[in-house]
């Protein structure tokens, strides 16, 4: 079952010794303890296959091996994102799929993996030394990226083995920052536990908030933390970058796609991909009473993570992606 990063509700301290400061020092260890326990190391794998029947056809498969909630997957090529990378496809588990030539047939395979077929000829054709990268945005891990390409000697019909951690590249600002905070927090937690070991343990009570509520927490953070979220991106390093794809991205467009960049070289800032759609908030959380998916039964072995989705303002059956409850 999924471990939710819920902080146990604490009984308010008795008036007197602890006071407000004491209450804060009691809450903080539990927050830090939860973060330390739930912190994991996610991975992204990428598999690239050249189809035997069509030498200009590639199948790219990407998967996420983390415990977080996947919000968006971006597949692209064309160099580092800040240096003219071109988005091939963007997949949202609930709000649909966008793909641009030469990409076709981008699909979710499972709740934690996607596939994409590339076909083309001439300027828009992929070639054997093209590197394809996939970036998964997840909460709380942040954005995680991996790249893959066919080995130079690959025969058509053979695929490169999935390439996980060796070329894993986290969104350094986010991940290192979170890692640093967690490391500091864990050290600080040990310090606090040592200081408080002679004190009686706080009494716990069940949380009075709806048990459903925290599951959508990735999608309605406070304004401050929401500003820190990134639209995921992925980059391609290739010597056969298509010359004709700069105009592949439509200007404007409906709903949450509207704010995607017209050129993938410009990294979106902030939560642009969902900024144009109002997200109903209830405090810092969003109610998921309208549905989404809940995991049924125990997770089978060797499966990827669950997904937590946007609560959809259009009503109870507007969801199409899964909500993983581990």
């Amino acid at each position: 079952m999924r471990t939710e990063a819920q902080v146990p509700a604490l009984q308010p301290p008795e008036p007197g010794l602890e006071g407000a400061m004491g209450h804060r020092t009691l809450v903080l260890p539990w927050v830090l303890l939860t973060l330390c326990v739930t912190a994991g190391t996610p991975e992204v794998w990428v598999q690239v296959r050249m189809e035997a029947t069509e030498l200009s056809s590639f199948t790219i498969r990407c998967g996420f091996l983390g415990s977080g909630s996947i919000s968006l997957v971006t597949v692209s090529w064309g160099g580092p994102n800040g240096a003219g990378g071109t988005t091939l496809a963007v997949l949202h588990p609930e709000r649909g799929i966008r793909q641009w030539a030469p990409a076709r047939q981008a699909r979710w395979e499972t709740q934690s993996s996607i596939s994409l077929i590339l076909e083309g000829s001439g300027a828009s054709s992929p070639c054997a030394n093209t590197t394809f990268c996939c970036k998964f945005a997840s909460f709380p891990e942040g954005s995680w990226e991996a790249c893959g390409s066919l080995p130079p000697s690959s025969d058509p019909g053979l695929s490169a083995p999935p390439t996980p951690a060796p070329i894993l590249r986290a969104d350094l600002a986010g991940i290192l920052g979170v890692s640093g905070v967690l490391l500091f927090g864990c050290v600080y937690l040990l310090h606090l536990l040592r200081r408080h070991k002679h004190r009686p343990a706080p009494r716990l009570q069940p949380s009075r908030t709806s048990p459903q509520a925290p599951r959508a927490r990735a999608w309605a953070p406070s304004q401050a933390s929401q500003a820190a979220l990134h639209v995921p991106y992925a980059t391609i390093n290739t010597s056969c970058r298509p010359a004709t794809l700069d105009t592949a991205h439509p200007h404007g467009g409906p709903s949450w796609w509207a704010s995607l960049p017209t050129h993938a070289a410009h990294r979106p800032q902030g939560p642009a991909a969902w900024a144009s759609t109002p997200i109903p908030a209830r405090g810092s959380f969003v109610s998921v009473e309208n549905g989404l998916y809940a995991q049924a039964g125990e997770r089978p072995p060797h499966t990827g993570p669950g997904l937590t989705l946007f609560p959809d303002p259009r009503g109870p059956r507007a969801m199409e992606g899964p909500l993983g409850v581990r």
Partner: antibody, heavy 117, light 107 residues
Framework: EVQLQQSGPELVKPGASVKISCKAS????????MNWVRQSHGKSLEWIGD????????NYNQKFKGKATLTVDKSSKTADMELRSLTSEDSAVYYC??????????WGQGTLVTVSA | DIVMTQSHKFISTSVGDGVSITCQAS??????VAWYQQKPGQSPRLLLH???FRYSGVPDRFTGSGSGTDFTFTISTVQAEDLAVYYC?????????FGGGTKLEIK
Amino acid sequence: EVQLQQSGPELVKPGASVKISCKASGYTFTDYYMNWVRQSHGKSLEWIGDIYPNNGDTNYNQKFKGKATLTVDKSSKTADMELRSLTSEDSAVYYCIRGVGLGFPYWGQGTLVTVSA
Amino acid sequence: DIVMTQSHKFISTSVGDGVSITCQASQVVSTAVAWYQQKPGQSPRLLLHSASFRYSGVPDRFTGSGSGTDFTFTISTVQAEDLAVYYCQQHYRTPYTFGGGTKLEIK
């Protein structure tokens, strides 16, 4: 609310063609694959193929290549499937379905096609 | 194509009992299996996808498990309204394929 409204039942003669339509509403039509599935009487379900409305890209089950042709009209948010050279084996209920790959959550009500002389 | 096999065409059970339906894929499909319920005269209804993820509004008596090639769909406490045909489907690769269906009958 997502809705897929299919055209009414069809009675056609063997060798003829028929076009079934599916009008979508309640979502961004171009962002989701439109799948088509056939269910013969008392039998299981067969995936015919899908179309990506944003660019009209199609993917067919090999079994239905030459039998089915999928098209979309973005302006009217309508997906069509034309079936040709019909035989009695093609008598079935045909469904349009919206999806992204993770199963098929939204189904049309189905269109019954009866092929009979 | 990936062949999905539901070994039982019919399963008979009583209201209040539990029942499991199995589905086997002819090749590994990770966890990419969905389950549907179809009642007479209705379109199929998605219950689970990715082997074990319940769709919106699906009661929690419906559960699923499995990975690779063997999958199980379970109704923990059968109710009268569960009388239907249940289909498995692989959503791992196109062409997407369905099992032959298992009809749940109430004793």
